[in-house]
Structure formats: C-alpha cells, structure tokens
C-alpha cells in the first residue's frame, strides 16, 4: 500500500531562526528502521539538509548534524531545524523511507514553506 | 569508464548451487548500490536483487527470496549473487547493474549494466 | 507487489515517426519511474529516471513525462537506431518491479 506523507505547508521560524514541523506518514506500517530525510528545494536544485534512521530503540535522530533534531513516535516524525537566516527561508520537504523490515517503500511530503526573518539589530546605547 | 563483468554462470542441475560475480572497475564501488537483474530466453526482465551502498540493506524479489543471497566486497569491488536450490524457471541471463545510492528525489535506477552471465538449469 | 503494465506490446514505425509508449503502474508511485532500452543479445540501457529526467549521454528525442500510476515515454523523431524493445520500471516499493516491455520494430 503506497504511503502518503504529509507537512504543514507553511512554517514561521522563530526569532532565534529555529522552525519545528511534524512529517507523519499513513498508513502506519509495522516498521522497525525509518529512515527520513530533509530536503530543500531551491529553483530546481535539491539539497540535503539532513538525514537519519530511527528505530524503535532510537528514537531521537540527526546526532550527526549541528542544525537538525528530531524526535520519531509510530509514524510521527517531529522536526527541528535551528541556526535558519533569512537566506535559508525556502521550501522544505521530507522523504520517508521505509527501510527495514522488507518491502522498501519510499514516500515524499509536499513540503513545508519556512520563512525566516532576520531579527533587527539591537540599536547601540550609550 | 564504468565497467561490470559478470561471471560464474553455466549450466546446473536442479536444486544444486551457482555463485555469480560481478567485478566493477572505472568507479568507486562502495559508493554505489548494486542490483541483479535477470532475463529468462526470450522474455522480459525481472528485479531479482538490491543491496545498498553499504552493505545495510538487501532487498529480493519475492521469486528468489529465502534461496538467492546477495553480497558484496567492496575491497574487491566485486558483487556476488549466490544462488541455492536452483530450479529451471532460475534460467536466464543474469545482469548486475549500478545504482547511485542516494538519489534525493530521483528513487532508485540502474545506470550502468554489465553484459549477463547464462544460467542454465536443467537436469 | 506493485504490477507494471505496457501499452501497446508492440508496434511499427517508421524512421522519423513520433512514437508514444505508455506504462502503467497497479498504484501510485509518484514519479519514481525509468524507462530503459534493450536491444537484442544486449544489456539494457537507461534513458529516463525520475519519470522525467534524461539519462546523460542519451538522446534528446526520448521524453518522459507522468507521475501517479500514468507515465508515457515519448520518441519525438525515431531513429534507426531506436528500433529496440522499450521497460518501464518502478522505483517506489521492493521488489522493483519492470514492465512487461514494447518492442518497436520496422513498419
């Protein structure tokens, strides 16, 4: 059965450049690794922001990456992308994979649109 | 350039035991996913086997599974299929072929075949 | 499983026709679709992944275009050399399945 992966379209990253977003895929197969993957879209280049496997044991992901976390429950993947500029405001999608045990499936979100706003510098004082 | 030869084929009795290779050359093995892909005579093509990049994962075709295993040795840049309780359906030109293994939105494809290997099964 | 199906499974064309090849996949698979090239006694060849995307090196009178479980590979100008039998195959879920094949030949 295809699975169907879905996000919020749009996300407003805080003013300390940190956006949160759920990635849940249905239906809710009876899988022991997951491995999921954030994208961003740029015109027509797509990048790796970040990627990881989770299981059942490990379900805190993306040790490896400096600005992606994520917390994985059933077929709920919450994700943090932290350190964002306003240049890094864009489309971002996550990929689901079904790794293990077999079939392999692989399933792909519409993506989430964040925005990110520079803050103001602070004005000097006196 | 990119190049996988396979060998190892030949003709075998039922229910005896066949292991294939693959050598590559021209790329960085271990960087790449490895598929088997059969063709009986005269018919079309069958998926028979994946393993990731790795080594991680290994996928089989519902055909083979419990009776083909793949493998590889990425220090000898050589992909194996070996092939248990073979029966006569099993005959065919056995192809290996690259898969990038990570292909953002692109899935899985194979992009460079080798030219086959016969397998015969017949008493 | 995923079945693959090919229309038509066969067809003749003549040098500089426009040749339509469609495929058809039991359920959505996205556009996690290629298409390859066989010729007889020879390793098949990739010419599209992606649904959509042109192998390098390849031809750029071979199109594909599709996504769901509706895909079609289209030859704008058939060359001599084209005349071959044309597989889908899906990407989307193991086993990765192949279509059953179009075989073009000389009208």
């Known amino acids: 059965e295809a699975i169907q992966v879905t996000q919020p379209s749009v996300v407003l990253a805080s003013s300390h450049g940190v956006a949160s977003f759920p990635c849940e895929y249905s239906p809710s197969h009876n899988t022991d690794e997951v491995r999921v993957t954030v994208l961003r879209q740029t015109n027509d280049q797509m990048t790796e922001v970040c990627a990881t496997t989770f299981t059942e044991k490990n379900t805190v992901g993306f040790l490896d990456y400096p600005f992606c976390s994520g917390t994985f429950n059933e077929s709920r993947v919450n994700l943090t992308i932290q350190g964002l500029r306003a240049v890094d405001t864009g489309l971002y999608l996550c990929k689901v994979e079904l790794m293990y045990p077999p079939p392999y499936f692989v399933g792909m979100g519409n993506g989430t649109q964040i925005y990110v706003i520079d803050p103001e510098p602070c004005p000097d004082s006196d | 350039q990119v190049q996988l030869v396979e060998s190892g084929g030949g003709v075998v009795q039922p229910g005896r035991s066949l292991r294939l290779s693959c050598a590559a050359s021209?790329?960085?093995?271990?960087?790449?996913?490895m598929h088997w892909v059969r063709q009986a005579p005269g018919k079309g093509l069958e998926w028979v086997a994946v393993?990731?990049?790795?080594?991680?994962?290994?996928y089989y075709a519902d055909s083979v599974k419990g009776r083909f295993t793949i493998s590889r040795d990425d220090s000898k840049n050589t992909l194996y299929l070996q092939m248990s309780s073979l029966r006569a359906e099993d005959t065919a030109v056995y192809y290996c072929?690259?898969?990038?293994?990570?292909?953002?939105?692109?899935?899985?494809?194979?992009?460079?075949w080798g030219q086959g290997t016969l397998v015969t099964v017949s008493s | 499983d995923i079945q693959m199906t090919q229309s038509p499974s066969s067809l003749s064309a003549s040098v500089g026709d426009r040749v339509t090849i469609t495929c058809r996949a039991s359920?959505?698979?996205?556009?996690?679709l290629n298409w390859y090239q066989q010729k007889p006694g020879k390793a098949p060849k990739l010419l599209i992944y992606?649904?959509?995307s042109l192998q390098s090196g390849v031809p750029s009178r071979f199109s594909g275009s599709g996504s769901g479980t509706d895909f079609t590979l289209t030859i704008s100008s058939l060359q001599p050399e084209d005349f071959a039998t044309y597989y889908c195959?899906?990407?989307?879920?193991?086993?990765?399945?192949f279509g059953p094949g179009t075989k073009v030949d000389i009208k």
């Open positions: 359920q959505s698979i996205s556009s996690y």
């Open positions: 021209g790329f960085t093995f271990s960087s790449y996913g």
């Open positions: 072929a690259r898969a990038p293994h990570y292909a953002i939105l692109t899935g899985y494809y194979e992009d460079y």
């Open positions: 992606a649904a959509s």
């Open positions: 195959q899906q990407s989307y879920s193991t086993p990765f399945t």
């Open positions: 393993i990731w990049y790795d080594g991680s994962y290994k």
